[in-house]
Each structure stands twice: as C-alpha cells, then as structure tokens.
C-alpha cells in the first residue's frame, strides 16, 4: 500500500467561452481508495478555491459554470490525490478560456447541385456557425472544413474553407450519391464534431470539371 501516484490535468474544453470543464487522469491508486480535489486561483488572486462542480463533466472532472468562468483571467489549477498513506499533486496548469474553445458543429448545412447554362456544373454548399458562438465581438474567428465522399467509398475528400460559410466543388463523379459534412474550429481552439451528414445525388449528366474546387 502506497500514497497515490501523481495525477495529470490533461484536457480543458469550453463550448462557447462562457463555461468550461477540465479533466484529469489519476495516477496509480496505491491500492487504496483515493479522493481527488481540484483547487484553483485566478491571475492576480492568492485565494485558492475548490472546484465548484465535480459532477457535470463526469468522472475525474471539474466544471466551471457561467458564474465561475472569466475570459479575462488565466486560471491556475492543480489536482490533489489523497489516500490513507499520503498525497500527491499534479503539476500546476494554466488555462486561458480563449484557447480551449471547442464549438458545437456548424448548423443548417445545405447542399445543391448547380448547373448554370454558361458554365460547368458544381456542387454548392452553405452552412451557419453554431448558435452558441458569438462572432459579433470580432475576436472569435471560426475556420471551417468540409468533407465528402460517395456513399459507398471508404475515403473522405477534405477541403479547407477558411472563414467562408459557403463553398463550391467542381470535380465530382456523375450518378453517385455523396455524403457531405462540415466542422469548425476557432483559430486557437479545437475542431468541433462533424455536422450530421447531408446526402446529395449527383445527376448522371454532371460533367466532370478539370479544376478541382474553389472558394465562393
């Protein structure tokens, strides 16, 4: 029987910069029941606080609700693991909420085949940013990525759309049914999950284009 091993806070995520959650990995348990507590202070403070919510994020997590979340101040936190034989502490972790945002997937993905008379046909898609993300403030830039594939294909074809919320793809296989998805990330944050797949049937008379794709 031994004191617990050193835990590690390995992940922090915020869906919208208004709340966030951090998760830790326990070290070895030393063969005894182990209690974990997360303590933190914000930059400019010396007063230590205990995690406000150990439940919402699931096991080995700490959730900071709206009243505990500030974008303006860096959080300094550590986890203490304690059993009957002693304690161990994680390394200190510094968290700036700006840099841990993982948004929800983009919304309202619509996909259409466009067949202008004077030009080659193309696949046109558009989407909306996730509702929880406030883009009006200006500091929050979302980047988008699209992936698509024929229904029975194994490999996805991926396109980076930058900050655009619409996109054209010119090179597709006629007669195929395609799955299309989009995801987003803030410049210094994390990719969202992929949006639900949207299906589109490419007409058999769709003319393959020499050029691959381009931004709208």
């Amino acid at each position: 029987q031994l004191p617990p091993g050193k835990p590690e806070i390995f992940k922090c995520r915020s869906p919208n910069k208004e709340t966030f959650t951090c998760w830790w990995r326990p070290g070895t348990d030393g063969g005894l029941p182990t209690n974990y507590s997360l303590t933190y202070h914000r930059e400019g403070e010396t007063l230590m606080h205990e995690c406000p919510d150990y439940i919402t994020g699931g096991p080995n997590s700490c959730h900071f609700g709206k009243q505990y979340t500030s974008m303006w101040r860096t959080y300094v936190m550590m986890v203490n693991a304690t059993n009957q034989m002693g304690s161990s502490f994680s390394d200190e972790l510094y968290v700036d909420v700006t840099y841990i945002v993982q948004p929800d997937p983009p919304l309202e993905l619509t996909v259409e085949v466009k067949q202008p008379e004077d030009r080659k046909p193309y696949l046109w898609m558009k989407w909306s940013p996730p509702t929880l993300i406030d883009l009006k403030t200006g500091w929050f830039t979302l980047l988008y990525e699209i992936r698509l594939k024929p229904e029975k294909a194994a490999e996805w074809e991926t396109h980076f759309a930058g900050q655009q919320t619409e996109f054209k793809i010119l090179s597709l296989h006629p007669g195929q049914k395609y799955l299309v998805q989009v995801r987003c990330k803030p410049d210094h944050g994390y990719w969202s999950a992929w949006s639900p797949a949207t299906f589109i049937q490419i007409p058999s008379d769709f003319i393959m284009n020499d050029h691959h794709h381009h931004h709208h």
């Epitope: 590690e8 390995f10 992940k11 922090c12 990995r25 930059e43 400019g44 974008m71 303006w72 860096t74 390394d91 972790l93 510094y94 968290v95 700036d96 700006t98 840099y99 841990i100 403030t137 200006g138 500091w139 929050f140 990330k185 210094h188 994390y190 990719w191």
Partner: antibody, heavy 118, light 112 residues
C-alpha cells in the same frame, strides 16, 4: 517532470534542408501546442510557428511560410521543424517550446544549433 | 508585424539595487478578447529562455516576488526590486496578441 529534448547540432550546405526534432515527455503530448523559435548568434528571438499536436493544425510566421514545415509524430511524442532552401542567415539555435492552454511559452527545449556553411 | 522595442540595451546593476526595463510595442497589445498578451522571458548565459511574467504582471510559478511587471496598451515595464547575482542574463519582452508572435531585442543585465 515536463521535458523537451531536442536533436543534436547540424552543419548544412546552403540550399539544403534540415529537420530538427523535439521529443516531449512528462505530459500528454497532444494536449498542448508546440512552438518553434530561433535565435541567430548574438541576436534576439524569432518565432517560426506553432503546431497543435492533437490535429497537426499549424500557424506560421509569414516570413517562414513555404520554407518551414512543422509536423508531429504522436506515437513517439515528437515534434519536428524542417527548414528548406537553407542560407547562411538561417544559422541559429532553434528552440521548441510548449504552452499550456495559453499562448505563452512555459517550457523550452535545450536548443539545436544549425550552422549553414559552404 | 508588431515591433517590440526594449530599452536600455544593457544595464549594469549593483547587487541589492533595483533595475527597470522598458518595452514598447508598435501597436496596442490589447487583444480583441480584452486580454493583453505581453510576457517577459529571461535567458541566462548558456541556457534556454525561461518565462518570468505572463500577461503583463503575473509571475509564473517559482518566479521570485522581486520581479514585477506593469503597463498597458503599448508601454510596459519589468522591475527587479533588488537584483541578485543569479538575475544576470538577457531579458526579452514578447507579445502573443498578434500573429506572428514577436520579441523585443533584449536587455542584457550584468552585475557591477
């Protein structure tokens, strides 16, 4: 203990490429961005770019875009910085550095001296 | 790119005396999220840089309280209240508000 251990010194010819490695230990490699900074002899510090090891997303200093390539190997917890079309002005110590969930550099590698000489 | 200008270029200080380093940026370092990402690093002779102060005025873990940072907008200062022999090296200010991140030219601190 967090450690960033870099590869050894290199001497390269002008026009060639160099690939510097940075092996991370003591933490979950995919959690934090890795940055690359260089320091020419007797000079200040210059930021080359950054990479998120979780998905290999990169941001580069425009000055190095097209010449510097940042990559990671998650299986060995190693980050790489490759610089191509080397010239004498690229002679410098190259550092990798790690952030937290922040945008400043909390841990630094020991540095790798790259000398470009004909 | 944001230009960071440090003064003085070098500083020779008697142990126990204060020292002050100034850093000026060519544009405001207030991020659109409201934070000011101005940091100070020390590079001791023969070593890699080490973080002293983050976000203008916050001492990093293990940094002695004789180091303090202040300033706002474009003008920032690092103060050492009582210089010790172990404080010798080159001090750099750095901004990470705007990409590319940039550093000042450095201030060399020596002991008299």
């Amino acid at each position: 203990e967090v450690q960033l251990v870099q590869s050894g010194a290199e001497v390269k010819k002008p026009g060639s490429s160099v690939k510097v490695s940075c092996k991370a230990s003591g933490y979950t490699f995919t959690s934090y961005w890795i940055h690359w900074v260089r320091q020419a002899p007797g000079q200040g510090l210059e930021w080359i770019g950054e990479i998120d090891p979780s998905d290999s997303y990169t941001n580069y200093n425009q000055k190095f875009k097209g010449r510097a390539t940042l990559t990671v190997d998650k299986s060995s917890s190693t980050a790489y910085m490759e610089l191509s079309s080397l010239r004498s002005e690229d002679t410098a110590v190259y550092y990798c550095a790690r952030s937290f969930f922040t945008n400043w550099f909390a841990y630094w590698g020991q540095g790798t001296l790259v000398t470009v000489s004909s | 790119d944001i230009v960071m200008t440090q003064t003085p270029l070098s500083l020779s200080v008697t142990p126990g005396q204060p020292a002050s380093i100034s850093c000026r940026s060519s544009q405001s370092l207030v991020h659109s999220n409201g934070n000011t990402y101005l940091h100070w690093y020390l590079q001791k002779p023969g070593q890699s840089p080490q973080l002293l102060i983050y976000k203008v005025s916050n001492r990093f873990s293990g940094v002695p309280d004789r180091f303090s940072g202040s300033g706002s907008g474009t003008d920032f200062t690092l103060k050492i209240s009582r210089v010790e022999a172990e404080d010798v090296g080159v001090y750099y200010c750095s901004q990470s508000t705007h990409v590319p991140f940039t550093f000042g030219g450095g201030t060399k601190v020596e002991i008299k």
